[in-house]
């Protein structure tokens, strides 16, 4: 059985479209499961992995490896 584009698995009922944009950064494995690109995490792979050590409370990042501080916090790790 050959599945349509972006459909995977037994019965071709698993849908996965690789994407690299605001809505996700992932490839699809042979079973149609999302595999996050390096630097991204979460079920949709749209949450950047911040710089190692970046304060989860006072820092955040839009891009992998970044660490942007909330107002009133500073330092390499916003701590």
């Amino acid at each position: 059985v050959t599945c349509d584009d972006y459909y995977y698995g037994f019965g071709c009922n698993k849908f996965c479209r690789p994407r690299d944009d605001f809505f996700g950064h992932y490839a699809c494995d042979q079973n149609g499961n999302k595999t996050c690109m390096e630097g991204w995490m979460g079920p949709e792979c749209n949450r950047a992995i911040c710089r190692q050590g970046c304060s989860p409370k006072h820092g955040s990042c839009k891009l992998p490896g970044d660490c942007r501080c909330q107002y009133g916090w500073q330092g390499l790790y916003c701590d």
Epitope: D5, F15, R17, D21, F22, G42, P43, E44, C61
Partner: antibody, heavy 119, light 107 residues
Framework: QVQLVQSGAELKKPGSSVKVSCKAS????????MHWVRQAPGQGLEWMGA????????AYAQKFKGRVTLTADKSTSTAYMELSSLRSEDTAVYYC????????????WGQGTLVTVSS | DIQMTQSPSSLSASVGDRVTITCRAS??????LAWYQQKPGKAPKLLIY???TLADDVPSRFSGSGSGTDYTLTISSLQPEDFATYYC?????????FGGGTKLEIK
């Protein structure tokens, strides 16, 4: 279960701004972007934009760029939509909405917030 | 931007009828299409996603089909609770635009 609870109705003057809130519960707030959709009276649905609460990244429909600002407060799991320079044609119900778990679109919706713009 | 053209804009039908609503995209959206049902004063409810997959708790009388640019929502046997407005929406790439809607009314 996933719940999105929005702030109450607003009556605004032309030229002013409005800020609508959407409090999320039942899931990890930073795992999914929050979208905003509006619906003018008797009209269809219009996608305005989305925010990724984890890092604050945003995507906007061209029509709203420069006039809408999406923000999120991770500490309270609340997303906000602020629309400025209001005009009468902005009178609409504004919805926050979230994707489902398997890459499908808007499975979860807030109850809607009516914003009326009138002098 | 991809535009979505939905037809008809309104439709009168009777309980038990088979009803078809179509949606055409201005470009290939590769099955990245959803259908919603909306009743007055309520938020839309997701019916179908990825063109043909039924969302949770949606009755099997609803079905979706199509590929490329042309998609169809079919209700095999209308029930009284199905009278509502239906919207298609693509989610291939931002902006995620909606069709203009189809108001399904009782004949």
């Amino acid at each position: 279960q996933v719940q999105l609870v929005q702030s109450g109705a607003e009556l605004k003057k032309p030229g002013s701004s409005v800020k609508v809130s959407c409090k999320a519960s039942g899931y990890t707030f930073t795992d999914y972007e929050m979208h905003w959709v509006r619906q003018a009276p008797g009209q269809g649905l219009e996608w305005m934009g989305a925010i990724q609460p984890g890092g604050g990244g945003t995507a906007y429909a061209q029509k709203f760029k420069g006039r809408v600002t999406l923000t999120a407060d991770k500490s309270t799991s609340t997303a906000y939509m602020e629309l400025s320079s209001l005009r009468s044609e902005d009178t609409a119900v504004y919805y926050c909405t979230r994707r489902g778990y398997d890459d499908y679109p808007f499975a979860y919706w807030g109850q809607g917030t009516l914003v009326t713009v009138s002098s | 931007d991809i535009q979505m053209t939905q037809s008809p804009s309104s439709l009168s039908a009777s309980v038990g009828d088979r009803v078809t609503i179509t949606c055409r995209a201005s470009g290939n959206i590769h099955n990245y299409l959803a259908w919603y049902q909306q009743k007055p004063g309520k938020a839309p409810k997701l019916l179908i996603y990825n063109a043909k997959t039924l969302a949770d708790d949606v009755p099997s009388r609803f079905s979706g089909s199509g590929s490329g640019t042309d998609y169809t929502l079919t209700i095999s046997s209308l029930q009284p609770e199905d009278f509502a407005t239906y919207y298609c929406q693509h989610f291939w790439s931002a902006p995620w635009t909606f069709g203009g809607g189809t108001k399904l009314e009782i004949k």
